[in-house]
């Protein structure tokens, strides 16, 4: 999915009002300096691409974050403010339901959510100095 035509300001507002708090709740008890940045993004569409990938694609050591509160709110925000996004996700959602497993918060999931926090911060960053 191409995130170029999303309403970035609305997504930013959704992040600031709820998604950020859910991410903090998930990470509670973890030091903010515990994980180094291992993924980056270079503009808002790119950030949303990487956020979608880390939030909804299973990775080794962290089978699924898709049922977490921050993930469901992320999905809702993208569906509302990214034209055509929800249609592209129907097949992916059906496949996810079949894969659903017992919820376990592993260290790998904590690291992944830490990277998500970094990506969201970059998505919301103020303009850099005019260099």
């Amino acid at each position: 999915y191409d995130f170029t035509n999303c309403d970035f300001e609305k997504i930013k507002a959704a992040y600031l009002s709820t998604i950020s708090k859910d991410l903090i709740t998930y990470m509670s008890g973890t030091k903010s300096t515990e994980f180094n940045n291992t993924v980056s993004c270079s503009n808002r569409p790119h950030c949303l691409t990487e956020i979608q990938s880390l939030t909804f694609n299973p990775t080794a050591g962290c089978a699924s974050l898709a049922k977490e509160m921050f993930a469901m709110k992320t999905k809702a925000a993208l569906a509302i403010w990214c034209p055509g996004y929800s249609e592209t996700q129907i097949n992916a959602t059906q496949a996810m339901k079949k894969r659903r497993k017992r919820k376990v918060t592993t260290n790998k999931c904590l690291e992944q959510v830490s990277q998500l926090q970094g990506l969201w911060r970059r998505f919301n960053r103020p303009l850099l100095k005019q260099q």
Partner: antibody, heavy 122, light 108 residues
């Protein structure tokens, strides 16, 4: 653990070519801009070239423009520097470094390799 | 082309504060990054975006940037701080990375 490992350095005659490589691990390589920086013996750091995270664009220092080419293979997590028409003044330790990128601005170089030595001598 | 000017050397007594400057025209309009390099080692980022610090760098390292001068401040200097320090900017208008000439910090 995030790591950059350079290879390909050595002794080469003036006018000849050399290809340096940088293997990245421990981070999502395709999301970062990548630089080559060099350091001549006893001298300071000199920037050589940068490539965008996607590989779509490249920029070079005037001292190497037209002779050096920076490329990347995001599927293999590797960065390369093809150095042609080498000169004695290209003798240096060559470092690769990663850099987050925002739009067309490259940020700080937060991870560096240990460097590979290139000596241009007849 | 843009030039960043650093003093070749700076000395500090143990426990005292060292200040390393980086001069350039309107440098305050650029984001300045600072690197520490010890002999035989690769550079290490110590301050980025003028005044931010990577999580692994001690709070003794701080930075500021305004007007024509950026400054790296190292408080409570230690022997382990002895190194070369380089400032760096990215000039997007000309698509160039620029390093300062480097400053050798000696802890007396």
């Amino acid at each position: 653990q995030m790591q950059l490992v350079e290879s390909g350095g050595g002794v080469v005659q003036p006018g000849r070519s050399l290809r340096l490589s940088c293997a990245a691990s421990g981070f999502t390589f395709r999301t970062y801009g990548m630089h080559w920086v060099r350091q001549a013996p006893g001298k300071g750091l000199e920037w050589v070239a940068v490539i965008w995270y996607s590989g779509s664009d490249t920029h070079y220092a005037d001292s190497v423009k037209g002779r050096f080419t920076i490329t990347r293979d995001n599927s293999k997590n590797t960065l390369n520097l093809q150095m042609n028409s080498l000169r004695a003044e290209d003798t240096a330790v060559y470092y690769c470094a990663r850099s987050p990128q925002w739009e067309d601005i490259f940020e700080s170089m937060d991870v560096w390799g240990q460097g590979t030595m290139v000596t241009v001598s007849s | 082309s843009y030039v960043l000017t650093q003093p070749p050397s700076v000395s500090v007594a143990p426990g005292q504060t060292a200040r390393i400057t980086c001069g350039g025209n309107y440098i305050g309009s650029f984001s300045v990054h600072w690197y520490q390099q010890k002999p035989g080692q690769a550079p290490v980022l110590v301050v980025y975006d003028d005044s931010d610090r990577p999580s692994w760098i001690p709070e003794r390292f701080s930075g500021s940037n305004s007007g024509n001068t950026a400054t790296l401040t190292i408080s409570r200097g230690e022997a382990g701080d002895e190194a070369d320090y380089y400032c760096q900017i990215y000039v997007s208008a000309s698509r160039l990375v620029v390093f300062g000439g480097g400053t050798k910090l000696t802890v007396l």
